[in-house]
């Protein structure tokens, strides 16, 4: 006889990276007929929802109206059908951003490179942090960690056109509290033989559209909660 129900999916909308004082919704998707959902934060019960009518609902939402560092951390959820509880969901790392300061991001040898050249990103932040994160925009929300007193290096190795895209970095005060994002750097990779010297390191869009990026770039992942769950879970491990 089955002792537990399958684990639910957990994700954050619009994104697991939440600017401070902005709103976020944590979604938990279980099964139709679940009479109770529990959201746990850092291992303790945080909130409970009892959907009505349970047979018509398989997802609940826990709304956080005002994100701050106390709300940042690891969330999981479980649900109950009758007396039977589910396995806990994977952990969702909810990150508060726009804390304290803004790092600067530079790329060597420059933002326009030729396929096969080795590229290194440098993220610098003068305030007290020793961990840095480099993110490339796009579906996979690929994150690299780097360490250093005021700056960190992110070597990409010999680049291909797959490395094309817009990059930003953050300083991390702890695993779940990140700085403001840096201005974006758009990396252009060409296979052509052409003079790319002194190609300006222009931002592709201003910093205030970062919020829009958070709302839009993970759409594909939100449609596939399993993949999104996996991405969020592995981000900070």
């Amino acid at each position: 006889q089955q002792q537990t129900l399958p684990k639910p999916f957990i994700w954050a909308e619009p994104h697991f990276m939440v600017p401070k004082e902005k709103q976020v919704t944590i979604c938990c998707q279980g099964n139709y007929g679940a009479v109770e959902y529990q959201l746990h934060f850092e291992g303790s019960l945080f909130a409970v929802d009892r959907p009505k009518p349970p047979e018509r609902i398989n997802k609940v939402q826990f709304y956080i109206p005002d994100m701050n560092s106390r709300m940042a951390g690891q969330y999981s959820c479980i649900y109950r059908v009758g007396e039977l509880w589910s396995e806990p969901s994977n952990l969702l790392d909810l990150v508060v951003t726009e804390m304290y300061d803004t790092p600067t991001l530079s790329v060597h040898p420059g933002p326009e490179v030729i396929s096969g050249e080795k590229v290194t990103f440098y993220c610098r932040l003068d305030t007290a942090t020793s961990m840095f994160l480099l993110l490339k925009e796009g579906r996979s929300s690929h994150v690299q960690r780097g360490y250093g007193k005021v700056q960190a290096e992110f070597p990409l190795g010999p680049v291909t056109t797959a490395h094309r895209g817009t990059y930003r970095c953050f300083g991390s005060y702890n695993n779940h509290a990140w700085s403001f994002p840096s201005e974006p750097v758009k990396l252009l990779v060409t296979g052509d033989i052409e003079n790319t010297s002194l190609a300006p390191e222009d931002p592709t869009f201003p910093a205030d559209t970062w919020g829009t990026y958070l709302l839009t770039t993970e759409t594909g992942l939100q449609k596939d909660h399993a993949l999104w769950d996996h991405t969020a879970q592995n981000l900070l491990r």
Partner: antibody, heavy 115, light 107 residues
């Protein structure tokens, strides 16, 4: 026309410090890396370090970490390298080179360390 | 640090001759290699970047290529102003390092 302007020569006493300048013309100074390179008389080239004027990121050759300090003045589009505790080993020509790939070079400053 | 072994250290050749200079990298540097030219007065000019990209204003007789960890600068037909010093430079892994140089002399 991109140009990197460096003074021709500096004569300094042993134990003293010197600040070398490199003024950039003809491009957006803040957008590109600036490198510094050493060449001893009749010898090859040695990379000292680089600075990104916009971000303030610096990267040094470990060999020169306690010898050289790189700074910039964005308002005058000038890069500086301070060399400290000078000895005869520091007598050399010092070049600045603009752009991550060393696209443009200054004429070099001859530093002579002599009592 | 990555060692760049440049050969030959000096080379005597005649006007119109085709010559090749080589740099061998001790570690993988991808295509992150420049060739530089230094005149007797100390002036340095970049000829080639990213292994094979010719700088604007550089004569077409100069070309760069790669075979594994060996990088070559070829001058297809030597002219009088080519008899100067040449250096390779890798910018793949910090500290960026130079080859020991090749002195090209007229025969």
């Amino acid at each position: 026309q991109v140009q990197l302007q460096q003074p021709g020569a500096e004569l300094v006493k042993p134990g003293a410090s010197v600040r070398l300048s490199c003024k950039a013309f003809g491009y957006t100074f803040t957008s590109y890396w600036m490198h510094w390179v050493k060449q001893r008389p009749g010898q090859g080239l040695e990379w000292i370090g680089m600075i990104h004027p916009n971000s303030g990121v610096t990267k040094y050759n470990e060999k020169f970490k306690s010898k050289a300090t790189l700074t910039v003045d964005k308002s005058s589009s000038t890069a500086y390298m301070q060399l400290s505790s000078l000895t005869s080993e520091d007598s050399a020509v010092y070049f600045c080179a603009g752009d991550g790939r060393f696209a443009y070079w200054g004429q070099g400053t001859l530093v002579t360390v002599s009592a | 640090d990555i060692q760049m072994t440049q050969s030959p250290s000096s080379l005597s050749a005649s006007l119109g001759e085709r010559v090749s200079l080589t740099c061998r990298a001790s570690q993988d540097i991808g295509n992150s290699l420049n060739w530089l030219q230094q005149e007797p007065d100390g002036t340095i000019k970049r000829l080639i970047y990213a292994t094979s990209s010719l700088d604007s204003g550089v004569p077409k007789r100069f070309s760069g290529s790669r075979s594994g960890s060996d990088y070559s600068l070829t001058i297809s037909s030597l002219e009088s102003e080519d008899f100067v010093d040449y250096y390779c430079l890798q910018y793949a892994s910090s500290p960026w390092t130079f080859g020991g140089g090749t002195k090209l002399e007229i025969k």
